[in-house]
Interface confidence: low
């Protein structure tokens, strides 16, 4: 007989890096039928959901509208039909941005390289933190961790023409806590002829995200995101 | 311009629930979290809870628990608030705020508030 | 719950004036603390929060300060329209709590 119910599936819209004072939607997805989701917040119960009605429901949104420290950190959710409860989601590691400072991003030996080159990007900055991020715009799933006082490196090794792109660097806080995003450093790759053409980067993850991040307004949240990739989260950890 | 507006004063026998609403304007309704507060005579604030319309999600003050309920229409962008097994201690008067995106926990528009009267 | 202590409950000052109204909290509550003016016929505006900040609207003659557990508002040249109960909120911690009330008379 069985136990439990299969474990849901948890993601932020519009992304899990929230700026501060802006808006998130944690949403839960289980299944048809579940007449309560709970999400937990560190470990605790945080909200409680019941969708009417429930046997055409299978997700629910559990709103922030003003993003800070406080709520930055590791949710879950689980969800009840009947009385049977499911396994609890994966942990989202939801992030608060745009803390305290903002960070500088560069590249050596600069924003235009051939293919093969060895690429390392350098991110500064001079208030309390020892712990670096840099993103790769298009794919959740490019963040690097480094570490410094001051400044951090991320050295790319020789790159080829998947390095290309936007990157921009963060300083974090703590594990929920980052910057605000350095100006974003636009690396090109020349390789050889038949590599040149702009393929697109991951259909994984919008290209837009960034400017949806940016640009989170108060009219409303991006509905149709894609679903963040597990990989950034699992760097958090 | 935003604007929460409560519904009239009520008068209620003791032992009865009463069901007030506060019909909010001028933004919009399921981005902004609504706060329930109350003010008897001459005194201070208390706050009741707070809900999130856009999902339904509600905090209560411990105290308030058995007492209030909160709930939210988002097709008429209406909040409400019922109060159930009233007594003397409960008349006063009920406000509804709506809290600011700051991430600071401060309620930036009011309500005008809705007296609430428990008397035989 | 944290406690939140107006020990002045009602001043008397004369326009022109420069009036402070202190509030207190049981514990550190970070800066979370809003200042709200009541008038007399019930209207409750927010005047500052996060101890500093003036909301959209407000006179720049209201500013707050404060830290840890202590916390003011300071209205400069004061005004007849600034007649009116004044409330400080910590937003630290819920249930989010009120102070009494300070009232502001004109001498």
């Known amino acids: 007989q069985q136990q439990t119910l299969p474990k849901p599936f948890i993601w932020a819209e519009p992304h899990f890096m929230v700026p501060k004072e802006k808006q998130v939607t944690i949403c839960c997805q289980g299944n048809y039928g579940a007449v309560e989701y709970q999400l937990h917040f560190e470990g605790s119960l945080f909200a409680v959901d019941r969708p009417k009605p429930p046997e055409r429901i299978n997700k629910v949104q559990f709103y922030i509208p003003d993003m800070n420290s406080r709520m930055a950190g590791q949710y879950s959710c689980i969800y009840r039909v009947g009385e049977l409860w499911s396994e609890p989601s994966n942990l989202l590691d939801l992030v608060v941005t745009e803390m305290y400072d903002t960070p500088t991003l560069s590249v050596h030996p600069g924003p235009e390289v051939i293919s093969g080159e060895k690429v390392t990007f350098y991110c500064r900055l001079d208030t309390a933190t020892s712990m670096f991020l840099l993103l790769k715009e298009g794919r959740s799933s490019h963040v690097q961790r480094g570490y410094g006082k001051v400044q951090a490196e991320f050295p790319l090794g020789p790159v080829t023409t998947a390095h290309r792109g936007t990157y921009r660097c963060f300083g974090s806080y703590n594990n929920h806590a980052w910057s605000f995003p350095s100006e974003p450093v636009k690396l090109l790759v020349t390789g050889d002829i038949e590599n040149t053409s702009l393929a697109p980067e991951d259909p994984t993850f919008p290209a837009d995200t960034w400017g949806t991040y940016l640009l989170t307004t108060e009219t409303g949240l991006q509905k149709d995101h894609a679903l963040w990739d597990h990989t950034a989260q699992n760097l958090l950890r | 311009q935003v604007q929460l507006q409560q519904s009239g004063p009520e008068l209620v026998k003791p032992g009865a629930s009463v069901k007030m609403s506060c019909k909010a304007s001028g933004y919009t309704f399921t981005d902004y979290v609504i706060n329930w507060g109350k003010q008897r005579s001459g005194q201070g604030l208390e706050w009741i809870g707070e809900?999130?319309?856009?999902?339904?999600?509600?905090y209560y003050n411990e105290k308030f628990k058995a007492k209030a309920t909160l709930t939210a229409d988002k097709s008429s962008n209406i909040a409400y608030m019922q109060l159930s097994s009233l007594t003397s201690e409960d008349s006063a008067v009920y406000f509804c705020?709506?809290?600011?995106?700051?991430?600071?926990?401060?309620?930036?528009?009011w309500g005008q508030g809705t007296s609430v009267t428990v008397s035989s | 719950d944290i406690q939140m202590t107006q020990t002045t409950s009602s001043l008397s000052a004369s326009l022109g004036d420069r009036v402070t109204i202190s509030c207190r909290a049981s514990?550190?509550?970070?800066?979370?603390l809003n200042w709200y003016q009541q008038k007399p016929d019930g209207t409750v505006k927010l005047l500052i929060y996060y101890t500093s900040r003036l909301h959209s609207g407000v006179p720049s003659r209201f500013s707050g300060s404060g830290s840890g557990t202590d916390y003011s508002l300071t209205i400069n040249n004061l005004e007849q329209e600034d007649i009116a109960t004044y409330f400080c909120q910590q937003g630290n911690t819920r249930p989010w709590t009120f102070g009494g009330g300070t009232k502001l008379e004109i001498k």
């Open positions: 705020a709506r809290r600011g995106r700051y991430g600071l926990y401060a309620m930036d528009y």
């Open positions: 809900i999130y319309p856009g999902s339904g999600t509600n």
């Open positions: 514990q550190d509550i970070s800066n979370y």
